[in-house]
C-alpha cells in the first residue's frame, strides 16, 4: 500500500500545521475557538469564529442575530449563513415600501391599474406595479382625472398601493390582479386598524414613515419613524429590534425609536456567547461535579467545559442556580468530541474520564 510518510514529512515538526492524507497536503491548524472556512486551511485568515445557530459573523467579527422572516407578509430570500444574515423580502403579490436591514419593515399589495390604464411593469418584491395609459394620449375611460392626467414629473402613473399590517396580512392570499373591483375591495379590507401606529392615512413624503409628533410650522423636528419593533440605526435605516422571546432571555431595555431592545439571560443563568444587544447562548450557573471545576469565565466559550482541578486546590463552584433546577447529571460523561458549536480544547487523560462538552450530545 502506498505510504504517506514522504508527504507527511513536509509539515513535520511544525505544530501549527498537520498533514491531511485525504488531500495529500499540509494544512494550517486553526487555533482553538476558531473553525476552518475550507477543507485544508492554508493561513490564519482561513479560520473564523463560529456562531450559534441563527447567528452570523458580521464584518466586525461579532456574532449577530439573523433577521427573522416570521411575519405573514415576508418570505425568506436567502438563508442565514455563517457569514451573512438571512434576507427577507415581501411575499409574492406585495412590494416593500419601507426597507429595513436585510428585510422589509412594511409591505404593500401591488397596485391594480385603474380603468384605462394597463400594466407597464409588473410589481416585484421591491417595486410596485407601474401603469401606463392603455393607448397613446389620454383615455376617456379613466376612472378619475387624477389617474389620467399626464404626470408633470414625467413619471409613470401608479395606482395607490394597499398597505398590509403584519397582523392582518394573512387574511387574504388571493393575488390582486386585473382591474376588478372585487380584488380592490379585498385588498382595501386589509388596511390597518385606525389605532395602528402606522402612517396610513397620513400625508407623508415617505410611505411607512411618519413624524414622531405633529411638526410645528417651519420646524425641522420631524424624525423618520420606523414600524413597531424596528429602530432607527446610526445610518438612518430602520433595523429590526432583537427579540427576547427565547425562554432563557429577559428584556433588559425596550425597543425604542433610536435603539434596539436589549436582552440578557434570565436570573440563574449567565451568558456563554454574547451577541449584539443580546446573548446567543445562556447557560445555568455551573454546578461543579466531584473532582471537576467549571470554567464559565470565557464569554467566547460555547459549552460549559470541565477539567480536573489542579492538585491541592478546592473547586471554586457556584451554588445551585436561583431557580433551584439541578443539572440532569452532575457528573460529566466522557465525550469523544466537542459539540459542533464548541470551541474549547482540552486534554483527555486516559486515566480519568473528563467531559469535553456538557451538552450531553
Amino acid at each position: 500500500f502506498p505510504q504517506d510518510r514522504p508527504f507527511e514529512d513536509t509539515c513535520h515538526g511544525n505544530p501549527s500545521h498537520y498533514y491531511d492524507k485525504a488531500v495529500r497536503r499540509c494544512c494550517y491548524r486553526c487555533p482553538m475557538g476558531l473553525f476552518p472556512t475550507q477543507q485544508c486551511p492554508q493561513r490564519p485568515t482561513d479560520c473564523r469564529k463560529q456562531c450559534e445557530p441563527d447567528y452570523y459573523l458580521d464584518e466586525a467579527d461579532r456574532c449577530t442575530a439573523c433577521v427573522t422572516c416570521s411575519r405573514d407578509d415576508l418570505v425568506e430570500k436567502t438563508p442565514c449563513a455563517w457569514n451573512s444574515s438571512r434576507v427577507c423580502e415581501c411575499r409574492p403579490g406585495m412590494f416593500c415600501s419601507t426597507s429595513a436591514v436585510n428585510s422589509c419593515a412594511r409591505c404593500f399589495f401591488h397596485s391594480v391599474c385603474p380603468a384605462g390604464m394597463i400594466v407597464k411593469f409588473p410589481g416585484t418584491a421591491q417595486k410596485n406595479t407601474v401603469c401606463e395609459p392603455a393607448s397613446p394620449g389620454v383615455s376617456p375611460a379613466c376612472a378619475s382625472p387624477e389617474n389620467c392626467k399626464e404626470p408633470s414629473s414625467g413619471t409613470i402613473p401608479q395606482a395607490k398601493p394597499t398597505p398590509v399590517s403584519p397582523a392582518t396580512s394573512s387574511a387574504s392570499t388571493m393575488p390582486v390582479r386585473g382591474g376588478t373591483r372585487l380584488a380592490q375591495e379585498a385588498a382595501s379590507k386589509l388596511t390597518r386598524a385606525p389605532d395602528s401606529p402606522s402612517s396610513v392615512g397620513r400625508p407623508s413624503s415617505d410611505p411607512g414613515l411618519s413624524p414622531t409628533q405633529p411638526c410645528p410650522e417651519g420646524s425641522g423636528d420631524c424624525r423618520k419613524q420606523c414600524e413597531p419593533d424596528y429602530y432607527l440605526d446610526e445610518a438612518g435605516r430602520c433595523t429590526a429590534c432583537v427579540s427576547c422571546s427565547r425562554d432563557d432571555l429577559v428584556e433588559k431595555t425596550p425597543c425604542a425609536w433610536n435603539s434596539s431592545r436589549t436582552c440578557e439571560c434570565r436570573p440563574g443563568m449567565i451568558c456563554a456567547t454574547s451577541a449584539t444587544n443580546s446573548c446567543a447562548r445562556c447557560v445555568p450557573y455551573p454546578i461543579c461535579a466531584a473532582e471537576t471545576v467549571t470554567k464559565p469565565q470565557d464569554m467566547a466559550e460555547k459549552d460549559t467545559t470541565f477539567e480536573a482541578p489542579p492538585l491541592g486546590t478546592q473547586p471554586d463552584c457556584n451554588p445551585t442556580p436561583e431557580n433551584g433546577e439541578a443539572p440532569a447529571s452532575t457528573s460529566p460523561t466522557q465525550s469523544l468530541l466537542v459539540d459542533s458549536q464548541a470551541s474549547k480544547t482540552l486534554p483527555i487523560p486516559t486515566s480519568a474520564p473528563v467531559a469535553l462538552s456538557s451538552t450531553g450530545k
Epitope: Y18, D20, K21, A22, V23, C27, R29, C30, M32, G33, F35, P36, T37, Q38, Q39, C40, P41, R48, Q50, A81, W82, N83, L336, L337, V338, D339, S340, Q341, A342, S343, K344, T345, L346, P347, I348, T350, L356, S357, T359, K361
Partner: nanobody, 123 residues
Framework: EVQLVESGGGLVQPGGSLRLSCAAS????????MGWFRQAPGKGREWVAR????????YYADSVKGRFTISQDNSKNTLYLQMNSLRAEDTAVYDC????????????????WGQGTLVTVSS
C-alpha cells in the same frame, strides 16, 4: 498527542458483515467531526463516511450508502463503522480521521489519522 487506533478488520466472505472501531485518546483538538476513509491496493484514498459529532449528522459515499453505518459512542470515546453486504471491491485498508466541520459546508478537515485496519472481502 492524539491517538486514533482502528480495530475490527479481517477476512470476510462476500455478503458478510464487519464492525470497525476507532478508539480515540490523548489530546482531541476541538474536533467535531470524525470520518472513515479507505485505500484499496494500488488506488487512491477514498472517503467512506463521516459524522458531525455535535449534531449527529451522518454522510456517506454513494458506493457504501445503505450498506455501511457510521456511529459514535461518547462514553467509550469510540467511533464505529458497521459494514454489511460486503463486496470484493470493499477490500481496503480503512483509516479513521478526526477534524473539524468546515464553516458553511458539510465537509471536514482531517487533522488526526489512525494507522488503518485491513479489511479483505474474499471467498
Amino acid at each position: 498527542e492524539v491517538q486514533l487506533v482502528e480495530s475490527g478488520g479481517g477476512l470476510v466472505q462476500p455478503g458478510g458483515s464487519l464492525r470497525l472501531s476507532c478508539a480515540a485518546s490523548g489530546y482531541i483538538y476541538s474536533s467535531n467531526c470524525m470520518g472513515w476513509f479507505r485505500q484499496a491496493p494500488g488506488k487512491g484514498r477514498e472517503w467512506v463516511a463521516r459524522i458531525h459529532t455535535g449534531s449527529g449528522s451522518t454522510y456517506y459515499a454513494d458506493s457504501v450508502k445503505g450498506r455501511f453505518t457510521i456511529s459514535q459512542d461518547n462514553s467509550k470515546n469510540t467511533l464505529y463503522l458497521q459494514m454489511n453486504s460486503l463486496r470484493a471491491e470493499d477490500t481496503a485498508v480503512y483509516d479513521c480521521a478526526a477534524g473539524r466541520v468546515v464553516l458553511g459546508a458539510v465537509v471536514c478537515t482531517n487533522e488526526y489519522w489512525g494507522q488503518g485496519t485491513l479489511v479483505t472481502v474474499s471467498s
